[in-house]
Interface confidence: low
């Protein structure tokens, strides 16, 4: 979510308060890993209700991503799995630990394998079927949201080359059984099955066997339905403001969600003289994040002793699973100058990103 | 070292107002939430509220909503609790904590101050 | 809110004996977000467990906690005096933030 390296924009407008997060981890896994992040507490202190993050949305733990409040594992990932991760406070959004993940060779359809698992000589003359990757093959409980893309995996090899198939629920498993069909790559000993449905869910059963013997592993895919909708941002909310320097300045913003939505406050800013990032994104720095456990939040936004530079264009964004809505609105501040600023303490400074 | 620090005890009459005060210091006192938790003569802890000195935010327990107003100044590390109109029912030890670092439990706590009302 | 009721109220008990004290919520308090704490008269509450089952820093090893869900334990395994106080269990996962209403572990 934000920047590799944090800049600061010192002043009223980017108060974040906290220390400024390390800077962000780049990690890569291969496609069908467990993607594992820790995010121990500073010191080695307690450490409690936390909400892992991804691009922005929070991650609704499922069995294949177990959320933990010092550790994250999501487990058979693929190239969705991609993407900016971050440990943050449950109520204040304070990110405790940022991550850039990408997870390598992963096609979403299944399509450009890269043949890892294809059987090798292994130098034995004759043999029954067996398990290259029994790793891999852990994880037998398989949950995901509905629309995803769902690869069961069962590499194998002997000698002759074992040959291998599916059932579903105990009974053959062939394309025509579900609207989308299935890829079956043999090759990669895998069944991809695209853009999963609630009729998807059952025991998924790959049988592989050569005239030496057949072995046979089972999982369970569950499919979870979505929320019916995106956040909702109640029209006219927030609204444009004028204030007088020195004075207080409330903005509401009315969201609705029947997930828990992610609620951020943000301000646009400018780095170094430019108000969009390298790829053309504007620059943004949190004034407050949080996730909201009701499904109809009114948050408010309060500014204190405003300034001229507390001027500008905000934004009220909600995020959840389903995506994000957002409102930009103004502040225009005059009136006389007022008196010179104290210096923001650098504790109280906000993380700006392009956003 | 971290310590919450509370204003002495008060003896007040009912319908009197009353702001007493709990002084965060040896931590970043805008980075984490302050709690307050009242425990009643001989009973047990109920909590009442938390904020958020970095911009005030307040999260009120339902109990205690309209009935006390929590504040805070993070210029002088001060987080305060507030009462309009003060009732012998408020009679009790209030005690200002602090939220640990991922914002759940209480991990430090003031010496608390005595209230009591009476006519 | 979630009620937590806590089990014995008096725990009459000598030292070097072991307690154990029970906490058990009306509902689920969702991933153990639930801490103990010790209090002692005339004095502030004191964190003792968070998570459950986490220790907090500088609580000496015979405290224990366990439990998930809606049943949670205390256990002191060998009372030593300064043990012998109040002991309240606290829900954090779900708000209105709860406590139970405390168990008195007396000298017997």
């Known amino acids: 979510e934000s920047l590799g390296t944090e800049q600061r924009v010192v002043g009223r407008a980017a108060e974040v308060p906290g220390p400024e997060p390390g800077q962000q981890e780049q990690l890569v896994f291969g496609s069908g890993d467990a993607v594992e992040l820790s995010c121990p507490p500073p010191g080695g202190g307690p450490m409690g209700p936390t909400v892992w993050v991804k691009d922005g949305t929070g991650l609704v733990p499922s069995e294949r991503v177990l959320v933990g409040p010092q550790r994250l594992q999501v487990l058979n990932a693929s190239h969705e799995d991609s993407g900016a991760y971050s440990c943050r406070q449950r109520l204040t959004q304070r990110v405790l630990c940022h991550f850039s993940v990408r997870v390598t060779d992963a096609p979403s359809s299944g399509d450009d394998e890269d043949g890892e698992d294809e059987a090798e000589d292994t130098g034995v003359d004759t043999g029954a079927p067996y398990w290259t990757r029994p790793e891999r093959m852990d994880k037998k409980l398989l949950a995901v949201p509905a629309a995803n893309t769902v690869r069961f995996r069962c590499p194998a090899a002997g000698n002759p080359t074992p040959s291998i198939s599916w059932l579903k629920n105990g009974r053959e498993f062939r394309g025509e059984h579900r609207i989308g069909g299935i890829k079956l790559r043999h090759q990669q000993w895998s069944l991809v099955m695209e853009s999963v449905v609630p009729s998807d869910r059952g025991n998924y059963t790959c049988v592989v066997e050569n005239k030496f013997g057949s072995i046979r592993q089972t999982y369970t895919l569950d499919v979870l339905e979505r929320s019916p909708h995106r956040p909702i941002l109640q029209a006219g909310l927030p609204a444009n403001q004028t204030a007088v320097l020195g004075s207080d300045v409330e903005f509401h913003c009315k969201v609705y969600s029947d997930a828990q939505p992610h609620i951020q406050w943000l301000k646009h800013v400018e780095v170094n003289g430019s108000k969009v990032g390298p790829d053309g994104t504007p620059y943004v720095t949190v004034l407050k994040s949080w996730i909201s456990e009701s499904v109809e939040a009114d948050v408010r936004l309060r500014l204190a002793n405003v300034s001229e530079r507390d001027g500008g264009e905000y934004l009220c964004r909600a995020t959840n699973f389903i995506g994000v809505a957002e409102k930009a609105f103004w502040l225009s501040v005059h009136g006389p100058r007022a008196a010179e600023e104290e210096l923001v303490e650098a504790d109280e400074a906000g993380s700006v990103y392009a956003g | 070292e971290v310590q919450l620090v509370q204003s002495g005890a008060e003896v007040k009459k009912p319908g009197e107002s009353l702001k007493i005060s709990c002084k965060g210091s040896?931590?970043?006192?805008?980075?984490?939430?302050i709690a307050w938790v009242r425990q009643m003569p001989g009973k047990g802890l109920e909590w009442m509220g938390i904020?958020?000195?970095?911009?005030?935010?307040?999260r009120y327990s339902p109990s205690f909503q309209g009935q006390v107003t929590m504040s805070a100044d993070k210029s002088i590390r001060i987080a305060y609790l507030q009462w309009s109109s003060l009732k012998a029912s408020d009679t009790a030890m209030y005690y200002c904590?602090?939220?640990?670092?991922?914002?759940?439990?209480?991990?430090?706590w003031g010496q608390g101050t005595l209230v009591t009302v009476s006519s | 809110e979630i009620v937590l009721t806590q089990s014995p109220g008096t725990l009459s008990l000598s030292p070097g004996e072991r307690a154990t004290l029970s906490c058990r919520a009306s509902?689920?308090?969702?991933?153990?977000?639930l801490a103990w704490y010790q209090q002692k008269p005339g004095q502030a509450p004191r964190l003792l467990i968070y998570?459950?089952?986490s220790r907090a820093t500088g609580i000496p090893d015979r405290f224990s906690g366990s439990g998930s869900g809606t049943d949670f334990t205390l256990t002191i395994s060998r009372l030593e005096p300064e043990d012998f106080a109040v002991y309240y269990c606290?829900?954090?996962?779900?708000?209105?933030?709860?406590f139970g209403q405390g168990t008195k572990v007396e000298i017997k």
């Open positions: 606290q829900q954090y996962g779900s708000s209105p933030w709860t």
């Open positions: 998570g459950a089952s």
């Open positions: 904590a602090r939220l640990d670092y991922s914002g759940s439990w209480f991990d430090y």
């Open positions: 509902q689920s308090v969702s991933s153990s977000y």
């Open positions: 904020i958020y000195p970095g911009d005030s935010d307040t």
């Open positions: 040896g931590y970043s006192f805008t980075s984490y939430w």
